[in-house]
Structures are given as C-alpha cells and as structure tokens.
C-alpha cells in the first residue's frame, strides 16, 4: 500500500512539475525591466525565451518574437534547449510511469517489469527536473552578467551619440515557476525511484522436496530457499514448501510415489 502511495504521489508531483516546466518555458516574464520613465507614462519590458513585450502604464502592450533578431545571447539557445529537453524527457517519463502505476493493470505485466518502468520514469523525471533547474539558473546568471557588463557607457556610432541606459533588471515570474517546477519534478523522480524498490519482486518460490533414505525413520528435509532480489532480506528465515512436500512439524515421513524424483 505504501509503495502504491509513494508511486502515485511521485507521479502526481512529477506531473505538476512538468506542467510547471511547460508553463515556464512558454511564459514571457523571464526577465522584467523599466525601459522608459517620464511623469506621464512608464514603459515596462518583459522578456521570455521566444518573444519580448513592452507594456506602458497607459495600457498599451506589444509583443514581438525574436525570429529575425541577430545578436541574441548564445546562452539563450542553451536555455531553450535545456527547457525543451526537460519537457521531452518529462513527457516520456509521464507516459512510461502511467503504464508502471501499480493501480493500473495492463495485461499480464509482471511486477518486475513495472519496477523497471518505475525506475526508468523516475530517472527521466530527475534528469528533466535538473534540466529545468539548470536552464533557469543559466538564464538568471545571464541576466546578472549582462546587467553588470552594460554599465552606462558612451560611444559614438554612425547615428551619433549612443548611450547605454542603466535600467534595473528583475527576475521574472517564469524563473521562480521554473525553479519550483524543476524541484517538484526532481522530487517526483526520487519518489518514483523509491517506489521502484518496493515494487521489485520480493521473492521467488522454489519447490522444496523431501528426500528419504530407505530404511530410515527420519526424513532429510532440505530447507526452503528464498531467492533474494537484493531489495529485500529474508528476515524471518521462513521455509517455503509446495506440492507434496511434508510440513516442518512432521517428525516421521512415510514413502510415497511423490517423494522420489
């Protein structure tokens, strides 16, 4: 029951996390800054991975994609790649984990197969979460670096004086969404990996057979052995018997046609 709960909770947490990663990737508010200020109006700027928007205090808003823009930071492509890889891995992980859920029966799928699928999806969620966290962190670092690099400098260009205006950059909402979502996906992945340990088959039963030496009154009974998967230990040291094997309580055993192999 605890395994099912851990697996189910891991799935739900990862699902929320991946939805958050998708939302963060699509959001425009990765960074925000004030572009222009005067007593009548202020122009705010918010930028995403795919487009940049300006919003004025008057209510005017305009967004523009980066499609034809040259001179974008190379790191932006890296961030885009990390977020997309995170989404793809997360989506595949979700697909795999649906079939791995203990509460869902698909044909005659064995627990060992479900355990493997749970582990696979868990690893995918962990990598997905790390990709998102890395992507958001790289972007945040890029913002801080660019801010300090663009100190107010004056130089002469073809169109006359060009001044880099010092404006205050702030981290946009998407960064926080990305960090939280990445963390949730990571936690969900860890929970799936933990659930995998409990899902792995505990034991394999081998039939124990009583062997009898003719003319003796006491039978030799080999102990039933429990094959360990490495995930669980045979703490009770119980013996497993099956078929025509005698019980442990019997002192004497009489030959029968079932006792000989």
């Amino acid at each position: 029951m605890a395994v099912t709960a851990c697996q189910g909770l891991g799935f739900v947490v990862s699902l929320i996390g991946i939805a958050g990663i998708i939302a963060a990737t699509c959001m425009d508010q990765w960074s925000t800054q004030d572009l222009y200020n005067n007593p009548v109006t202020a122009v705010f700027n918010y930028q995403g991975l795919w487009r940049s928007c300006v919003r004025e205090s008057s209510g005017f808003t305009e967004c523009r994609g980066y499609f034809t823009l040259l001179g974008l930071p190379a790191m932006l492509q890296a961030v885009r790649a990390l977020m997309i890889v995170g989404i793809v891995l997360g989506a595949i992980g979700l697909l795999v984990s649906i079939f791995a859920l203990k509460c869902i029966r698909i044909g005659s799928m064995e627990d060992s197969a479900k355990a493997n699928m749970t582990l696979t999806s868990g690893i995918m969620f962990i990598v997905s979460g790390l990709c998102a966290i890395a992507g958001v962190s790289v972007f945040a670092n890029m913002l801080v670096t660019n801010f300090w690099m663009s100190t107010a400098n004056m130089y002469t260009g073809m169109g006359g004086m060009v001044q880099t205006v010092q404006t205050r950059y702030t981290f946009g909402a998407a960064l926080f969404v990305g960090w939280v979502a990445g963390g949730l996906t990571l936690i969900g992945g860890v929970m799936m990996c933990i659930a995998c340990r409990g899902l792995a088959p505990e034991e394999t039963n081998y039939k124990a057979v009583s062997y009898h030496a003719s003319g003796h009154s006491v039978a030799y009974k080999p102990g039933g052995f429990k094959a360990s998967t490495g995930f669980g230990s045979n703490t009770k040291n119980k013996k497993i018997y099956d078929g025509g094997a005698r019980t442990e309580d019997e002192v004497q055993s009489y030959p029968s046609k079932h006792d000989y192999v």
Partner: nanobody
Amino acid sequence: EVQLVESGGGLVQPGGSLRLSCAASGSFFRIVAMGWYRQAPGKGRELVATITRGGSSYYADSMKGRSTISRDNAKNTVYLQMNSLKPEDTAVYYCNVRVEVPFFQPNDYWGQGTLVTVSS
C-alpha cells in the same frame, strides 16, 4: 546600429511655425520611445517632447500648448510641430530614440542635431 536623419530646422520669424522630423533606420529590435531635446548656446540639453510606442506623449513646460509631437511606428519616424515660436526657442534640436535590446540594457541613440533659429 541605428542611423537618425533629422530635418526641418532653419530660420523662422517669431510667432512662426516649424515642423521637425526624425527618421530612424538600421537594424534594431524595437523603438520604445522617440523624442526631441534641445540645447541653447551656453546651456545644457533639455527635453522638449517625447512620445512612447503606444502614443503617450510628454511635453516640457516651456513648450506645452505650443508644440505637438507625433510618430509613425511603421516608418520609425517622429515629428515635432512647433507653433508660436519665440527667440528663446533658438537652439540645436536633437532627436532621441530609445531602442530595446533584448536581454541587455536599452540604448539611447542621438541625432547630429538640427539648428532652429528664431529671429526677425
């Protein structure tokens, strides 16, 4: 890089009118605001009027009621219509453009200036 071409300056009599225009060209992402500043002989540069991409305009007290700023977003051009000019309006008028640079600080570009002389 952004190139600014200013025109419309010249000699005008007191009480007269003048229309300045400034066209921005070159490779840039988006112009956020355009405006006009002026610098009279021996004085500092002061704002005349400015207009944002959304059309919100702001005027210096000295030019309020006597000037109108407008812009054509499609042509990346800003116009300043000045009426009832006074001798104290004599100055070099500079075009100013603020350009958005994604993920970097915005840039302010300045024109070379056009001289407006108000004299009888």
